[in-house]
């Protein structure tokens, strides 16, 4: 669609084109399966334009339909370590707060590989906080070309 002259003068954020691409900061302490993310030009090729980080978790600031994508590569990994553990070795992306909107959006299993990646379109609302839970005793790589997480506003 064509933008009006007035719209062309506005910053992208005001048009609703919120977007973020994050890199892994660290994993959580014991009993906390969450991955903690970071973003910003000083860190390399990660950024936040609209969404924000709240204690390492991504918070949405604008309603809309978003493309959510994630890739996680394990730094300590073998075909046996990703299949023999008693606990399921899965990566789940979901809305973790507010509690009233809590829901799983993506769930992936490592099976016998060291990398998993997926994406989906989903409606998100202002204030939704996305959590990425890595269950099982697995240590993700912090290499920025191996592990990353992002969202892109697509339409209202």
């Amino acid at each position: 669609q064509r933008l009006s002259r007035a719209q062309q003068q506005l910053p992208l954020e005001s048009l609703g084109w919120d977007i973020a691409e994050l890199q892994l900061n660290h994993t959580g302490p014991q009993q906390d399966p969450r991955l903690y993310w970071q973003g910003g030009p000083a860190l390399g090729r990660s950024f936040l334009r609209g969404p924000e980080l709240d204690k390492g978790q991504l918070r949405i600031r604008r309603d809309g339909i978003y493309m959510v994508h994630i890739q996680v590569t394990l730094a300590i990994c073998s075909s046996t370590s990703t299949s023999r553990h008693h606990h399921p070795t899965t990566l789940a992306v979901g809305i973790c707060s507010p509690a009233s909107r809590s829901i799983s959006l993506l769930r992936l299993s490592f099976h016998q590989g060291c990398t998993i990646a997926s994406q989906r379109l989903t409606p998100l609302a202002r204030g939704d906080t996305l959590c990425t839970n890595l269950t099982g005793t697995l240590l993700p790589s912090r290499n920025t070309d191996e592990t990353f997480f992002g969202v892109q506003w697509v339409r209202p």
Epitope: H26, G28, P29, Q30, A75, L139, R142
Partner: antibody, heavy 120, light 108 residues
Framework: EVQLLESGGGVVQPGRSLRLSCAAS????????MSWVRQAPGKCLEWVSA????????FYAESVEGRFTISRDNSKNTLYLQMNSLRAEDTAVYYC?????????????WGQGTLVTVSS | EIVLTQSPGTLSLSPGERATLSCRAS???????LAWYQQKPGQAPRLLIY???SRATGIPDRFSGSGSGTDFTLTINRLEPEDFAVYYC?????????FGCGTKVDIK
């Protein structure tokens, strides 16, 4: 300057326990995964155990799983290895080693090691 | 687990010569995640090379790594007196991380 200083080694009888410590300085300790690597006299290096920067994720070699426990106290910048049910084949110099920032278990800094001798 | 075989066991050379050390893996090393270390008697290992070919901080450019898949090489051009030591390869692409048993480079 990154420094890793191991302590706690000594002579111990089979079946007994020992706790090793590694005091770290010169880097943000809580940001890095750490490992213990051992070297029996005249033998190869052997990775023993690893722990994530936060301490929430731990990993063990099959040879020590169920007997050794790795832990860390980030407030004290210290890494630990609790070794129970020690065997003669656990005799080695034990090194603590810092992982690269990527979390991958290759080691850009090592301590000088502490000798553990398991003998009756 | 991946077994790493280093050869030769001992390499006798003179200062100024080139050393070529081999490390062969029992299966392909994921993403060429292979490191080389130097160890002198009574000392801890020192990281030389990671990712098969990237030099660690402060390592002189006479040390170089190459190879992929299952065959890797550490080359030391123009051996200096301080280079006589034991060299270990280590793969870290698959758990558990494993080490070779070393190549000793000694003075002829």
């Amino acid at each position: 300057e990154v420094q890793l200083l191991e302590s706690g080694g000594g002579v111990v009888q089979p079946g007994r326990s020992l706790r090793l410590s590694c005091a770290a300085s010169g880097f943000t300790f809580s940001s890095y995964a750490m490992s213990w690597v051992r070297q029996a006299p005249g033998k190869c290096l052997e990775w023993v155990s690893a722990i994530s920067g936060s301490g929430g994720r731990t990993f063990y070699a099959e040879s020590v799983e169920g007997r050794f426990t790795i832990s860390r106290d980030n407030s004290k910048n210290t890494l630990y290895l609790q070794m129970n049910s020690l065997r003669a084949e656990d005799t080695a110099v034990y090194y603590c080693a810092k992982h690269d920032y990527s979390n991958y278990p290759y080691f850009d800094y090592w301590g000088q090691g502490t000798l553990v001798t398991v003998s009756s | 687990e991946i077994v790493l075989t280093q050869s030769p066991g001992t390499l006798s050379l003179s200062p100024g010569e080139r050393a070529t050390l081999s490390c062969r893996a029992s299966q392909s090393v994921r993403s060429n995640y292979l490191a080389w270390y130097q160890q002198k008697p009574g000392q801890a290992p020192r990281l030389l090379i990671y990712g098969a070919s990237s030099r660690a901080t402060g390592i002189p450019d006479r040390f170089s790594g190459s190879g992929s898949g299952t065959d890797f090489t550490l080359t030391i051009n123009r051996l200096e007196p301080e280079d006589f030591a034991v060299y270990y390869c280590q793969q870290y692409g698959s758990s558990p991380p494993t080490f070779g048993c070393g190549t000793k480079v000694d003075i002829k």
